[in-house]
C-alpha cells in the first residue's frame, strides 16, 4: 500500500497540466458539438462543476463530470471524450461514488443535452484552471 501522502503522489505541476489539457479538449468538444445547427441550450441540465468546500484540485466534481461525458459518448460518438475521460480519471479517487445520469430519450432533446453539457464543461474547465492558478498564487504569498 501507499506510504506517501496522496498530495505527494501528484505534484501541482501535473494537476495544472491535466486541467490545461482538459480545458483544451473541452474546447475541441464544444467546437465539434456546435457544428450541429438549430440546437439551443437547455435550462434543464446542470453539470456539477466546482465544490466550494474543497481545495483545488479536489474541488472539481470529476466523477460527476465523467458520468455526464460518458453519457454524451454513448449518445454521440465523440472520440475526444475518450481522452477527456482518461484525464479526468487522473483526478478521480478509486473509491469515489458513482453518479447516475437520467438520459433524454427524444432525439432533439439529446442534442440539447449534449450541447448544454459540452458548453458547461468548457466553462467549468476555465473556472477550474482559474481556481488552480489563484490557489497556487495564494500558496506562494
Amino acid at each position: 500500500s501507499h506510504t506517501l501522502p496522496v498530495r505527494l503522489l501528484r505534484p501541482s505541476d501535473d494537476v495544472q497540466k491535466i486541467v490545461e489539457e482538459l480545458q483544451s479538449l473541452s474546447k475541441m468538444l464544444l467546437k465539434d458539438v456546435e457544428e450541429e445547427k438549430g440546437v439551443l441550450v437547455s435550462q434543464n441540465y446542470t453539470l456539477p462543476c466546482l465544490s466550494p468546500d474543497a481545495q483545488p484540485p479536489n474541488n472539481i466534481h470529476s466523477p460527476a463530470i465523467r458520468a455526464y461525458l460518458k453519457t454524451i459518448r454513448q449518445l454521440d460518438n465523440k472520440s475526444v471524450i475518450d481522452e477527456i475521460i482518461e484525464h479526468l480519471d487522473k483526478l478521480i479517487f478509486q473509491d469515489a461514488p458513482e453518479t447516475n445520469i437520467s438520459v433524454p430519450t427524444d432525439t432533439h432533446e439529446c442534442k440539447r443535452f449534449i450541447l448544454t453539457i459540452s458548453q458547461q464543461f468548457s466553462e467549468c474547465m476555465d473556472l477550474a484552471l482559474k481556481s488552480l492558478t489563484s490557489g497556487a498564487q495564494q500558496a506562494t504569498t
Epitope: 501507499h2 501528484r10 505541476d13 460518458k70 482518461e86 480519471d89 487522473k90 478521480i92 479517487f93 478509486q94
Partner: antibody, heavy 122, light 107 residues
Framework: QVQLVQSGAEVKKPGSSVKVSCKAS????????MQWVRQAPGQGLEWMGA????????RYSQKFKGRVTITADKSTSTAYMELSSLRSEDTAVYYC???????????????WGQGTTVTVSS | AIQMTQSPSSLSASVGDRVTITCRAS??????LAWYQQKPGKVPKLLIY???TSASGVPSRFSGSRSGTDYTLTISSLQPEDVATYYC?????????FGGGTKVEIK
Amino acid sequence: QVQLVQSGAEVKKPGSSVKVSCKASGYTRTRYWMQWVRQAPGQGLEWMGAIYPAEGDTRYSQKFKGRVTITADKSTSTAYMELSSLRSEDTAVYYCAFPEGPYAAPYGMHYWGQGTTVTVSS
Amino acid sequence: AIQMTQSPSSLSASVGDRVTITCRASRNIGNYLAWYQQKPGKVPKLLIYYAKTSASGVPSRFSGSRSGTDYTLTISSLQPEDVATYYCQHFWKTPWTFGGGTKVEIK
C-alpha cells in the same frame, strides 16, 4: 492479498482465435483500468489495450484494432482478451496487469498475471 | 501515439557500479511514468511509479528521477541479482506505450 490468475497455455492454428482470461481476487475497488500486454520470444513488452471493468470501456493499440477484443465480467471479476486471425507472429506470452490506487487512472501497474503462452503454429 | 525512446538498449557493468537508464518521451507526460524489472522467464515487476515513487519492497538502490521529458532509472550500486531487462511505460494517454527495454548484464 491481490492476485491475478490467467488461463493456461494455448496452441492455435493460423487464422483461428484465442481467448485468454484473467481473474482478479483480493481487490475491492471498482474504478481502475486493467491492461493487456504481450511479449514475443526474445522481444520487449508490447501494449495491446486496456479496459475499465466497471463500465466495459475499452482502449486498443492501433496495431491490434479490429483483431483484439477486451471484455470484463464484473460478477466474476474476470477480464478477457480475445485475439482473432492469428498468425505465427502472435506467438507470445500474454499478460494482464492492473494498478494499485489511489486514483482511477494508472501511473504504474503493480499487479501482473503469471502470463499465458500462446503458440500459433500450423 | 507518444513514443518512449529508451537508452541504452544494453549495458554491461561491474558489481557496485552506478547504472543509469534513460527514457525520453516524445511529448510532456508529466510524472506519469513507471519502470519495470523483468528477469529472464519471469513476470515484469514494478520498481518505480509516478516517475520517482518506489514500489513496495523495492531495494533503496533503485531510484527514479525526471527532467522535463527525460526520465532516469538509477541503480546506485549494481548487484548480481539486478541482471534483468528494464522497461519504462508512460500513462499520460492511451496507448500506454513501453520503451524498447535495456538489458543489464554483469561484467
